[in-house]
Interface confidence: low
Amino acid sequence: HNTTVFQGVAGQSLQVSCPYDSMKHWGRRKAWCRQLGEKGPCQRVVSTHNLWLLSFLRRWNGSTAITDDTLGGTLTITLRNLQPHDAGLYQCQSLHGSEADTLRKVLVEVLADPLDHRDAGDLWFPGESESFEDAHVEHSISRSLLEGEIPFPPTS
């Protein structure tokens, strides 16, 4: 499996999509896990509804949500309020019994928010500071939004 990179902005919601063959994975629940080390285990973060027919219902574990379009063959994971510690290697999985097939390997990278400017016209980026903790990061997004979610701050 090649690794697909998804770059999200700190404080925003990042949506990760994992396409799959809907017939091949018919009836299978899905999961999102975080790879622990290059050859380590993949630690489960969140999985779809226990009843496969209800896989379209969004399930949350903390700030991570999962939903599955079983007809279209697309698993969608949402990482809300993305933080630097969310960066890393993940997998989308298709579950069958105690086994899991990897649908996609995903590398999540966290960028700074260009609209979080401390000085007018001055952008702050990862290269300018030791860590994200130096800056105030407001909610912002460049992705599809969740229903009812208002991730952007009002303009001042």
């Epitope: 990179v5 770059q7 999200g8 960028l111 260009p114 609209l115 980026f125 997004i141 599809s144």
Partner: antibody, heavy 120, light 108 residues
Framework: QVQLVQSGAEVKKPGASVKVSCKAS????????IHWVRQAPGQGLEWMGI????????SYAQKFQGRVTMTRDTSTSTVYMELSSLRSEDTAVYYC?????????????WGQGTMVTVSS | EIVLTQSPGTLSLSPGERATLSCRAS???????LAWYQQKPGQAPRLLIY???SRATGIPDRFSGSGSGTDFTLTISRLEPEDFAVYYC?????????FGGGTKVEIK
Amino acid sequence: QVQLVQSGAEVKKPGASVKVSCKASGYTFTSYYIHWVRQAPGQGLEWMGIINPSGGSTSYAQKFQGRVTMTRDTSTSTVYMELSSLRSEDTAVYYCARAPQESPYVFDIWGQGTMVTVSS
Amino acid sequence: EIVLTQSPGTLSLSPGERATLSCRASQSVSSSYLAWYQQKPGQAPRLLIYGASSRATGIPDRFSGSGSGTDFTLTISRLEPEDFAVYYCQQYVNSPFTFGGGTKVEIK
């Protein structure tokens, strides 16, 4: 399909202002950043700034600070870029561009470009 | 401001040949923050690569990106007739986002 359609070519005198529009369609307008990039004839690409169509907040390249204003109209899914105090070196094709899902600071959907000529 | 220098300025090759384009940054750019574009005359640029090595949607696998630090490379494994164009690199680690001056890939 997803597309950005820009306004037509403009000819302006030095010292004047120009306002270029960029109408988005085929996607949720408020969910993606829009950038502006320009290209002088026979030259390379130059990033001008970024606007968040949801809140309207902006950030501009220092070079254009004080001369450029980016705004949006959510009712028509249109972004505007106004450049004032025009000089001959502002003659260029001006592009609006949307960021893709995978990375918010690169540009995968571009407008067709608007040629702005500054000449006395 | 990060300055990106592309070389060579012009690359003369035949269809089927391998093209190697270079982009050098004036200061270190994390590999996560470099992109490549293709531009044909009279057209807007087209995103090829982001994150130094991730192909954008719909980009053929003959295009690949690599590199880190200050040196980055775009490789076209086997040139097709439609690949003859100008190629730009772009950094987005620091404001302002900047582009290289471009490399023109022309038919030999």
